[in-house]
């Protein structure tokens, strides 16, 4: 009874299509696979960024797999062939591992890469990234930003740089069609007459770096002798009401400070008849139903009532 063996996949490699971190892992079928024609051969693929403690594991019938990686670090991957038990009249048979690595040869010392990279997707409409030049780089150093997300044919360069002293220190992006809820890849590289500049790679999802506009049209409405309803409207723009959380800051007679976080565009405040002055501000943030993270908006303009009887039905600034 001869032992069934299977070879590992051939030509296992990591292919960089130039998408700034979105890589293809590709391989060819093992040698002598024709003995298992009636069988659906599978492949177990494991991969990770070098330095990561955990491997991502995929089982696939395909000859390729795609995923995003941090190109600031190297990548390692391994794959073997699996023959399911149905093919071998017994237990699953595995080949030996085929292994491969990939990294971008770093140019320049780490200090030359951009510092304090910060990207904000303003009101889910306008992406702006800014950075500081690397430590100790000369004024002739210029940085260039490239970006890619699934849907673009190739990586694009920034066409509207923010400059300081003739150096690029940021990028205003054009309208980014169908770019949220997917990985957005950025590379900032540089050039200098004097020394090589280290590239930096960044990956994020746009919906997680949204900074909305502040809420507008703040109003007061007396609900009862001891309740006032504070109301406001969602900021103008593409973000739907269901995506907002709000933080309110209320000052009563310059003494009491109330802060609250709410999901709706209203807040009911308990008051006393002695209240002579009431002011509140609101700010907004994209909530957990629409993103994993976000940035609080600026505070709205302050809305105050003072010196009049709060029993009036509606109080507008």
């Amino acid at each position: 009874d001869t032992e069934i063996k299977v070879n590992p996949p051939q030509d296992f490699e990591i292919v960089d299509p130039g998408y700034l971190g979105y890589l293809y892992l590709q391989w060819q079928p093992p040698l002598s696979l024709d003995h298992f024609k009636e069988c659906t051969v599978e492949y177990e693929l494991k991969y990770r960024n070098i330095g990561s403690e955990t491997w991502k594991t995929i089982i696939t019938k395909n000859l390729h797999y795609k995923d995003g990686f941090d190109l600031n670090k190297g990548i390692e991957a391994k794959i073997h062939t699996l023959l399911p038990w149905q093919c071998t009249n017994g237990s699953e048979v595995q080949s030996s591992w085929a292994e491969t690595t990939y990294w971008i040869s770093p140019q320049g010392i780490p200090e030359t890469k951009v510092q304090d990279m910060d990207c904000v997707y303003y009101n889910w409409q306008y992406l702006l990234c800014s950075w500081k030049p690397g430590i100790g780089v000369l004024l002739d150093t210029n940085y260039n930003l490239f970006y890619w997300y699934e849907g673009l044919d190739h990586a694009l360069q920034c066409v509207d740089y923010i400059k300081a002293d003739g150096q690029n220190i940021g990028c205003r992006f054009p309208y980014l069609e169908a770019s949220d809820y997917k990985d957005f890849y950025i590379c900032v590289n540089g050039s200098s007459e004097n020394k090589p500049i280290r590239s930096s790679y960044f990956t994020f999802q746009l919906q997680n770096i949204v900074k909305p506009l502040p809420p507008v049209y703040l109003t007061f409405t007396r609900e009862s002798s001891c309740e006032i309803k504070l109301k406001w409207s969602i900021p103008l723009g593409p973000i739907p009401a269901r995506c907002f959380d709000y933080e309110i800051e209320i000052r009563e007679d310059d003494t009491t400070l109330v802060t609250a976080t709410v999901e709706n565009e209203t807040y009911t405040l308990k008051t006393t008849n002695e209240t002579r002055q009431l002011c509140f501000v609101v700010r907004s943030k994209v909530n957990i139903y629409c993103s994993d993270d976000g940035i609080w908006s600026e505070w709205s303009d302050k809305q105050c009532w003072e010196g009049e009887d709060l029993s009036k039905k509606t109080l507008l600034r």
Epitope: D11, E13, I14, V15, P29, S32, D34, T40, K61, L63
Partner: antibody, heavy 122, light 107 residues
Amino acid sequence: EVQLVESGGDLVRPGGSLQLSCAASGFTFSRNGMSWVRQTPDRRLEWVATVSSGGSYIYYADSVKGRFTISRDNARNTLYLQMSSLKSEDTAMYYCARQGTTALATRFFDVWGAGTTVTVSS
Amino acid sequence: DIVMTQSHKFISTSVGDRVSITCKASQDVGTAVAWYQQIPGQSPKLLIYSASYRSTGIPDRFTGSGSGTDFSFIISSVQAEDLALYYCQHHYSAPWTFGGGTTLDIK
């Protein structure tokens, strides 16, 4: 339409050099291994060299090893064959061919270009 | 290296006939054999791979069979446009070699 277009063939003296190019279109170039296959004047087909989809794996026929270099530029969808120390027996029609890939098999050639002629003669 | 031998250099046949072209490998290649057709003035075209799998768009009058060392390529009903040179090739392990070719001549 899947297309391979070779160029660079010429008449060259023995010991000379030549670079062939193959422009690919109509498919995702970076997903397929690519090869050069030549057809001698007596119409025999001879596999010359193969490069894997990402360029990490390269295979040569013994008859060209050390003299020919296969390479690819996935950004430009182009395959190259740099030929040096050419001999009269390298005279042939050189075809660029895409490596077919199925779940069970590979290393056959499912798309061929029209070819470019290399003549090595003094 | 694995040598692929096509014993018949020429086969003469008539339209509508069934014709068989054979190819022998010098060692076991499993079913890793492909067949190509080269019409005069054109480049080769893949017909069959893995001994018996038809390439996309190939008419079903073309079939392939065999395993190990002996392989056959059959045209069940020869058409005038089948006048061509036919090659076998093993796609087992490098170097990938071709047979010397069989010319199909239509009477």
